[in-house]
């Protein structure tokens, strides 16, 4: 017998422009009689138009759901019931062409055409897009709370918040032709479960989703999203019930920004400028195409592109790039958002220069991309350091920390984390270098101690960018840099005149004058350390819970020793700004650092003083005994301590700690403690300082209490945020 033909529903969404009608405010209110009568007429016209073509035999249903400016734009969807084998033949492009052809054929016709009875439809203003049944369901669920807004040039329109009786709302936004819409979303509550989705068309078409955001994102408190043109839809889905809008939405039309540039680079190394997608830091728009042409002054140089939280990867099988497509020297690469820095190094083989193209291949976009560009020496890309091929970064070599994910920076080291004597390649410990005592056979450890040397892993970089050989020369009372910069900013790290961490002892007033107690509603939550007159450093994980993310909750106490009483040396502050490290990852504890800006500067006293911050090259030698302080629990699972506890811990080699924790220890972490356990940080010590005393008597911040397995357990060390691994970010924020 005959097999019945399988029919499938094909859904289309679109808009058309009516030239003989004008938009009025009445048409924005679905309950108005104007809206009802216009919808009935427009719906009739749409059905007649479709059925006038060969699509008529497949017609199933249609609906006009909204109107907009231009003189009058109708937004609609329709469903065709088509044989499965014809599905691909009736793409949105084909359907649009058939309908336009029909409209054009009757433009000058004097014959009566049903769909022209009331409306003069502009054939050039017809748009047909692919949709789905799911899209229509999503649209219908918002129709009880549907807002249309037209925003004129030069206007910034603040959108009215959602109707909290509805579970979903849609803002249909339109701007002047030839401009693009920029939507600004600002989360105003610390926690919520609301979801917002932005679309590059008038309705919630999944295939035209620009981005969706969820739940009062703390890492992105403000999001700016660009549409590819003058139309956009925003859909809100209710989270927890709230009488306050957890966000503010505003929209403005902006002009298209050209994204093409020709640059000639100077004959110097390091960063020379910035390239970015239009309206950075706004999300790039769905049809972004950037083309940057850079000319390099000589073939000695290569071109370096330094990215922030974004990397380039080879994409297999020509799949579309979901986070931006790049072509560099005809190589296709895909962008990928990561919580790490990354550099792309482009070898230069011809003087013609390098063209870099960036394209958004799909409608789904993401945060704007910014890249610093500059030159590197092709024969020596990382002077004094190691070029990590995995991420293109220059990292310290042979310092005992595997900075490169493949660990090659710590391979083939003659002297690891020690100084290599010139004479016979023997290794001596770094504190013995430039200490006035020759330890190498011919005294090479004491050579060049008063002059500039090439920069390397353990050299200190002065402000004038020259380097000195002496390890850890900061604030030791002797100027080693020509410009004296190693002895600047040295009003730090000195204990006051002073007469529980697991296994610890009670501290006295002024003994640890940088120690901070971070409290919420009178309860000690985390430790911290004063690093500048208005800045306290702590661990990012202290703010992990959404309920802890608001600055207004926190009070910072300095000069405190006892939790249950106050003494005259103690001062308190509110928090004006809270900054988590942009690369902080909750699951891995990587980059576990946050900075709190105090509401007013501290007045230094014997009980309140900042700790010294180490330079990036500062070497905290494994084996060194340092101190941790805090009011954390005195035993695993116990209550916090009333008195400020102190305990000495030994710094542990990175490779050993990494093995103990089965390779969960990153280069931004540092381990300390004892193999027998007993002495360790515990709950409530988080964010507190791990400090090491320099030969000068000053205390330097080596780490922040971050994580570990239990407290004081045998065979498990405490893991701390390694300050030298995050110091660039700290300095960038604080200065």
């Amino acid at each position: 017998g005959y097999k019945a033909e399988v029919m499938v529903s094909q859904v289309y969404s679109g808009s058309l422009r009516v030239l003989n009608r004008h938009f009025s405010q009445d048409l924005t209110r679905r309950e108005s009689s104007a809206f009802r009568s216009e919808t009935a007429k427009a719906q009739k016209m749409l059905k007649e138009l479709i059925t006038s073509t060969r699509l008529g035999t497949y017609y199933n249903s249609s609906s006009v759901y909204s109107f907009g400016e231009g003189p009058l734009t109708c937004f609609f969807w329709f469903i065709l019931q088509i044989p499965e084998h014809r599905r691909l033949m009736l793409s949105p492009e084909v359907v649009q062409a058939l309908l336009v052809e029909e409209l054009l054929s009757t433009v000058n016709s004097s014959a009566a055409v049903p769909y022209r009875a009331e409306y003069e439809v502009d054939p050039e203003g017809l748009v047909i897009l692919e949709a789905s049944v799911k899209d229509i369901a999503a649209l219908n669920s918002t129709l009880g709370c549907y807002r249309y807004s037209y925003v004129g040039q030069g206007q910034v329109l603040r959108l009215k918040g959602p109707d909290h009786l509805a579970s979903s709302c849609l803002w249909h936004l339109q701007g002047p032709k030839d401009l693009m819409l920029k939507l600004r979303l600002e989360w105003t509550l610390a926690e919520c479960r609301d979801r917002l989705a932005m679309y590059d068309v008038a309705g919630p078409l999944e295939k035209r989703l620009i981005t969706s955001v969820y739940g009062c994102s703390r890492q992105e408190p403000v999001v700016e999203v660009l549409a590819s043109g003058a139309i956009m839809a925003v859909v809100w889905k209710k989270g927890l019930h709230s009488y306050y809008d957890p966000f503010v939405l505003s929209v403005q039309p902006v002009v298209f920004q050209a994204c093409e540039v020709n640059l000639t680079l100077d004959n110097r190394l390091d960063s020379q400028g910035v390239l970015s997608t239009p309206y950075f830091p706004s999300y790039y728009s769905p049809q972004t195409h950037c083309s940057w042409h850079l000319t390099v002054p000589s073939l000695d140089y290569g071109l370096a592109l330094w990215f922030d939280a974004y990397a380039l990867r080879r994409q297999k099988y020509d799949l579309p790039c979901t986070q931006g497509q790049w072509t560099i020297q005809n190589r296709r690469l895909c962008g990928l958002r990561i919580l790490q820095p990354y550099a792309e190094r482009i070898p230069v083989v011809a003087t013609a220069g390098i063209t870099i193209n960036f394209t958004s291949q799909i409608s789904l976009t993401g945060p704007g991309v910014r890249v610093h560009y500059g030159l590197y020496n092709q024969s020596d890309p990382c002077p004094g350091e190691f070029l990590c091929s995995v991420n293109g970064l220059c990292v310290p070599a042979c310092d005992g920390v595997k900075d490169c994910p493949n660990g090659l920076d710590e391979r083939n080291c003659v002297c690891r984390a020690t100084f290599q004597c010139k004479e016979d390649s023997t290794c001596i410990s770094l504190p013995k270098v430039c200490d006035g005592q020759p330890d190498c056979l011919n005294g090479s450890d004491e050579e060049q101690c008063q002059e500039g040397v090439p920069c390397g892993t353990f050299t200190f970089q002065c402000e004038d960018r020259s380097c000195v050989k002496k390890p850890n020369p900061q604030c030791d009372g002797r100027p080693d840099c020509r410009d004296g910069s190693d002895e600047e900013h040295c009003d730090c790290g000195l204990q006051g005149p002073s007469s529980r961490i697991v296994g610890g002892a009670v501290s006295s007033e002024g003994e640890w004058p940088w120690q901070a107690s971070l409290q919420v509603r009178g309860r000690h939550i985390c430790g911290g350390a004063l690093i500048a007159d208005r800045w306290v450093i702590t661990a990012a994980h202290c703010f992990q819970e959404d309920s802890m993310a608001s600055t207004v909750l926190w009070t910072v106490f300095l000069g405190k020793v006892w939790q249950n009483s106050r003494w005259p040396g103690e001062v308190s502050f509110k928090v004006s700004r809270l900054l988590l490290h942009p690369y902080h990852e909750e699951d891995s504890h990587d980059y576990d650092v946050a900075l709190l800006q105090l509401d007013h500067p501290v007045v230094r006293s014997a009980a309140v003083r900042p700790v010294c911050l180490p330079a990036r090259s500062h070497f905290f030698e494994p084996g060194l005994h340092c101190w941790i302080t805090g009011w954390g629990a005195l035993r695993e699972g116990g209550p916090i301590s009333n008195a400020l506890q102190k305990v000495d811990v030994q710094l542990i080699p990175q490779d050993l700690c990494s093995e103990v924790y089965r390779y969960q220890v990153t280069p931004r972490m540092l381990c300390a403690g004892y193999r027998k356990g007993k002495k360790d940080a515990c709950q409530g010590d988080s964010g507190g300082p791990l400090v090491c005393k320099a030969l000068s008597g000053r205390w330097f911040l080596a780490g922040l209490v971050s994580w570990g397995l239990g407290c004081g357990r045998p065979n498990y060390f405490g893991v701390y945020t390694r300050i030298t691994g995050v110091i660039s970010w700290i300095q960038q924020v604080v200065t």
């Epitope: 023997t426 001596i428 030698e621 084996g623 005994h625 030994q650 403690g673 004892y674």
Partner: antibody, heavy 119, light 110 residues
Framework: QVHLVESGGAVVQPGRSLRLSCAAS????????MHWVRQTPGKGLEWVTI????????YYTESVKGRFTTSRDNSKNTLYLQMNSLRVEDTAVYYC????????????WGQGALVTVSS | QSVLTQPPSVSEAPRQRVTISCSGG????????VNWYQQVPGKAPKLLIH???LLPSGVSDRFSGSKSGTSASLAISGLQSEDEADYYC???????????FGGGTKLTVL
């Protein structure tokens, strides 16, 4: 490179005293606990004593308590073992070994110094 | 009499695998990490395994350690003639307040 070199081994009569030294190089001596371990000829290893990096704690094995004293001079990078009232059963090769605080793992050993107690 | 008990000797042919056991009690192996040392005749001992099962850098991955309860073991795979040596286990003993060693096991590669 970490180097530990023992010296002072000798043949002595029972009841006499002897002092062993261990010169350390290639690491920051003052950061590390130091141990003495001995090995009776043809026999196994026996731990003798530990001295903390900061000299706050010193432990001895029961058989040498009251007779042996361990000390260190961090400025000279040197470890000492003062052995008094020596007995025949103290005859052994004495090794100094570096230890991480609280770990009791000996990651570097000296070449050993032979102490023979004999009449 | 050693606090930790090891077999006095083991032997195996080249390229084979051998296991050396070490048993103790709750005050040492049961509560503390086990370390293994290799001593080639006429030389000082050398750290082979620490933290029960971790290899210090420079030690061949033919060596592996494990621990269960109050017993530990050292396994050597792909035996080579240069593995001929005495092997000692060691751990801290909480009740003796000191490090205790096993009596040592002499490995012969046949």
């Amino acid at each position: 490179q970490v180097h530990l070199v023992e010296s002072g081994g000798a043949v002595v009569q029972p009841g006499r005293s002897l002092r062993l030294s261990c010169a350390a190089s290639g690491f920051t001596f003052s950061n590390f606990d130091m141990h003495w371990v001995r090995q009776t000829p043809g026999k196994g290893l026996e731990w003798v004593t530990i001295i903390r990096y900061d000299e706050t704690n010193i432990y001895y094995t029961e058989s040498v308590k009251g007779r042996f004293t361990t000390s260190r001079d961090n400025s000279k990078n040197t470890l000492y073992l003062q052995m008094n009232s020596l007995r025949v059963e103290d005859t052994a090769v004495y090794y100094c070994a570096r230890g991480w605080t609280g770990s009791y793992v000996f990651d570097y050993w000296g070449q050993g110094a032979l102490v023979t107690v004999s009449s | 009499q050693s606090v930790l008990t090891q077999p006095p000797s083991v032997s195996e042919a080249p390229r084979q695998r051998v296991t050396i056991s070490c048993s103790g009690g709750s005050s040492n192996i049961g509560n503390n990490a086990v370390n293994w040392y290799q001593q080639v005749p006429g030389k000082a001992p050398k750290l082979l395994i620490h933290y029960d099962d971790l290899l210090p850098s420079g030690v061949s991955d033919r060596f592996s350690g494990s621990k269960s309860g109050t017993s530990a073991s050292l396994a050597i795979s792909g035996l080579q003639s240069e593995d001929e040596a005495d092997y000692y286990c060691a751990a801290w003993d909480d009740s003796l307040n000191g490090v205790v060693f096993g009596g040592g096991t002499k490995l012969t590669v046949l």
